[in-house]
């Protein structure tokens, strides 16, 4: 373990991993739920680790696959997280901020439609309010850059630089409340090309842009079957 930074060495020795990279390094290389410690040793956070996709080590912060969990929730839920890591869940904006504050991360978005087609998009840089004194006051601003296509197209770069919005905290650039209009919560601009926290509408839908949409792949009238947003140290 020589050459490991002090805080990393402490985590390694105390077996208190920051993320799924640490967990992988500890020898756990199967997909599953593990505990991470983004805010320090006293607060374990369950997370799903994808240890197989593209070499593994992915810390999953959003996962949807069956509509069993409502994602039309308020600010506090999105700040702290909700759902279960062994099912559908959102890790929490504060946890995501703390992770990306400590390390440089890349992002991978995995998508699946109801015809069992899969696609992905990658971003070489991902962070949440990296320069903020208070991430919450900064709105948990999204920063993504360095898109690479996996068939899904780029629906997220449009949202880079935007604050996170929920129906009860409207921080978008639109005259109306994007979260309410889109039945979700996201880094809305005016309003979105990606709405991965929208209603689970099960494929094609008549309503405009309020499903689990990734516009560059399936447009605004198709709600995806499965989504995973995951980060890995770059």
């Amino acid at each position: 373990v020589s050459g490991i930074r002090g805080d990393a060495l402490e985590r390694f020795c105390l077996q208190q991993p920051l993320d799924c990279d640490d967990i992988y390094a500890q020898g756990y290389q199967s997909d599953g739920v593990y505990l991470i410690y983004p805010s320090g040793p006293s607060v374990p956070v369950p997370v799903f680790c994808d240890m197989t996709t593209e070499g593994g080590k992915w810390t999953v912060f959003q996962k949807r696959f069956n509509g069993s969990v409502s994602f039309f929730r308020g600010w506090n839920d999105y700040k702290l997280g909700f759902g279960r890591a062994d099912g559908e869940y959102w890790l929490g904006l504060q946890n995501m901020h703390l992770l990306t504050l400590k390390q440089k991360y890349e992002l991978r978005v995995d998508l699946e439609d109801f015809e069992n087609n899969t696609a992905y998009a990658k971003y070489a840089d991902f962070s949440i309010s990296p320069n903020a004194v208070s991430a919450e006051e900064d709105g948990y601003t999204l920063f993504v850059a360095g898109f690479e296509d996996g068939g899904a197209g780029d629906s997220l770069s449009y949202h880079s630089g935007q604050k996170f919005s929920t129906f009860d905290r409207d921080q978008d650039l639109f005259v109306q409340n994007c979260a309410a209009l889109s039945s979700g919560a996201f880094w809305f601009r005016s309003c979105h090309f990606a709405n991965l926290n929208g209603f689970y509408l099960g494929g094609s839908h008549l309503s405009y842009a309020n499903g689990i949409n990734w516009a560059q792949w399936k447009g605004f009238y198709y709600s995806l079957k499965r989504t995973e947003m995951k980060i890995r140290r770059a």
């Epitope: 069992n116 087609n117 690479e148």
Partner: antibody, heavy 115, light 106 residues
Framework: EVQLEESGPGLVAPSQSLSITCTVS????????VHWVRQPPGKGLEWLGV???????NYNSALMSRLSISKDNSKTQVFLKMNSLQTDDTAMYYC?????????WGQGTSVTVSS | DIVLTQTPAIMSVSPGEKVTITCSAS?????MHWFQQKPGTSPKLWIY???NLASGVPARFSGSGSGTSYSLTISRTEAEDAATYYC?????????FGGGTKLEIK
């Protein structure tokens, strides 16, 4: 085991069209995209295009007007068709599975354009 | 189109030497991918997403870089590393390859 196998005509007359089939096994075409790459004798690699899982395609802009990629998911086959071949299209043609990057390649099929 | 320029085009080294192959992009790219090809065989994915070794690639290989400048390094070259190495970008269409670097072992 992931496998890709290209099959083509070998010899094509100038101005004629080329059709190559890539037959895959060990994975589903609804799960992974497939790329086409070619390599002229003694030269480097040139990316031709890709067909993604949902059938959406991207092409090399220099060849787009005469290139077409399609697939048959049930037959686990991907097809490359190129029109108006000239002698400088003589190359080894490869198909490769996506994710991560081009992780698995076929053995290639040699195409010679000659009268 | 993004042009990738590899240097050197050919290099000859002795076993045990450190080798660095560079790939310069005409504009910024998100990641660089590297392929190894030996005569008469298909290319093999060697390093993906700048720094991740593909399955079965020896740990003496590493990749690094960002923006327009990337490199593949072999810490101690072995005879089996003799091959041509290609860099590739897929940050914008059309995807492009570098011209290749042929590594010869003395």
């Amino acid at each position: 085991e992931v496998q890709l196998e290209e099959s083509g005509p070998g010899l094509v007359a100038p101005s004629q069209s080329l059709s190559i089939t890539c037959t895959v096994s060990g994975f589903s075409l609804t799960r992974y995209g497939v790329h086409w790459v070619r390599q002229p004798p003694g030269k480097g690699l040139e990316w031709l295009g890709v067909i993604w899982t949902a059938g959406n395609t991207n092409y090399n802009s220099a060849l787009m007007s005469r290139l077409s990629i399609s697939k048959d998911n049930s037959k686990t086959q991907v097809f490359l068709k190129m029109n108006s071949l000239q002698t400088d299209d003589t190359a080894m043609y490869y198909c490769a599975r996506d994710d991560p990057s081009m992780a698995y390649w076929g053995q290639g099929t040699s195409v010679t354009v000659s009268s | 189109d993004i042009v990738l320029t590899q240097t050197p085009a050919i290099m000859s080294v002795s076993p045990g030497e450190k080798v660095t192959i560079t790939c310069s992009a005409s504009s910024s790219v998100s990641y660089m991918h590297w392929f190894q090809q030996k005569p008469g065989t298909s290319p093999k994915l060697w390093i993906y997403s700048t720094s991740n070794l593909a399955s079965g690639v020896p740990a003496r290989f590493s990749g690094s870089g960002s923006g327009t400048s990337y490199s593949l390094t072999i810490s101690r070259t072995e005879a089996e590393d003799a091959a041509t190495y290609y860099c590739q970008q897929r940050s914008s269409y059309p995807y492009t390859f570098g011209g290749g670097t042929k590594l010869e072992i003395k």
